[in-house]
């Protein structure tokens, strides 16, 4: 099939006092092989500080996955989610506390 770019969505949730979990979700993409990872100040976080979901079919012939990490509240602006898929790439910021979702569809 032809390439379908992912929709990338970054969310935040309270983890514990002073910490938040930021989750980057990619959905609706084809083929399955996608790079999704967190960066701090533009530098990759180690694997052991990130949690990944499996790449799973979403029932529409495309795929979905996610990556999450825990960060200190107030440092959100230092973190970005990086995506590579089928020769394209993009970075996605953590939304500020008063907004909840950032959606980006990439072509």
């Amino acid at each position: 099939g032809s390439t379908v770019p992912p929709m990338v969505n970054v969310t935040r949730s309270e983890a514990s006092e002073g910490n938040i979990t930021v989750t980057c979700r990619a959905s609706g993409f084809y083929p399955w092989n996608i790079t999704l990872s967190w960066r701090q100040d533009g530098v990759s976080l180690s694997h052991d500080t990130q949690q990944w979901g499996d790449v799973l079919p979403d029932g529409n012939g495309t795929y979905q996955t996610w990556v999450a990490t825990r960060i200190c509240q107030g440092e959100e602006q230092r973190f970005t989610c990086y995506m590579e898929h089928s020769g394209n790439h993009s970075t996605h910021p953590v939304p500020s506390g008063n907004s909840h979702h950032h959606h980006h569809h990439h072509h």
Epitope: N33, I34, T35, V43, S46, H47, D48, E84, H85, H89
Partner: antibody, heavy 120, light 107 residues
Framework: QVQLKESGPGLVAPSQSLSITCTVS????????VNWVRQPPGKGLEWLGM???????DYNSALKSRLSISKDNSRSQVFLKMNSLQTDDTARYYC??????????????WGAGTTVTVSS | DIQMTQTTSSLSASLGDRVTISCSAS??????LNWYQQKPHGTVKLLIY???SLPSGVPSRFSGSGSGTDYSLTISNLEPEDIASYYC?????????FGGGTKVEIK
Amino acid sequence: QVQLKESGPGLVAPSQSLSITCTVSGFSLNGQGVNWVRQPPGKGLEWLGMIWGDGSTDYNSALKSRLSISKDNSRSQVFLKMNSLQTDDTARYYCARGAHYGKRWYFDVWGAGTTVTVSS
Amino acid sequence: DIQMTQTTSSLSASLGDRVTISCSASQNINNYLNWYQQKPHGTVKLLIYYTSSLPSGVPSRFSGSGSGTDYSLTISNLEPEDIASYYCQQYSKLPPTFGGGTKVEIK
């Protein structure tokens, strides 16, 4: 068919800088990372750093002050520059494509390597 | 940095033998481990990724296992073309680090 090929100077004088080019084919540098790894004679492998599809770089902190990795997507080339070479930088230098899919991160295709000798 | 130790630097085995190569990490690396084969002339090839996954084109006589800090690569039926050095590599933490290698020779 994915291929990577390193080209370097062969011989570098101590305190001078090293420049190596990795020319790739069969994939786009815009969408996958390339790593640099070296191997001193008779020793093991050492990861130097990498460049991602968007041009961001990660370096081995032990060498970060001397290293620079860049690329030219249109020419399908990745460049390694290392400053202030000493004799213990004598090694075979490899570039390798990085595959980073969730929990999996590996170097799936390697170049043949180029030998660099630091000597006066 | 995480230290990777391959205690056996070289071993001799007969064709058809089952060969096991061990690798230990200085801390838990959560299965974030790959194995590479380096032929005597220097060519490097990915053999196993994420502890036990086999890339396409790698013969099924190669297998990997382990968890925590201890991992192994097994060649179930040694062939002449398996004469090479084998390196483990962790990617749990940056920088990725390699073991010192195990050279496999024919008796």
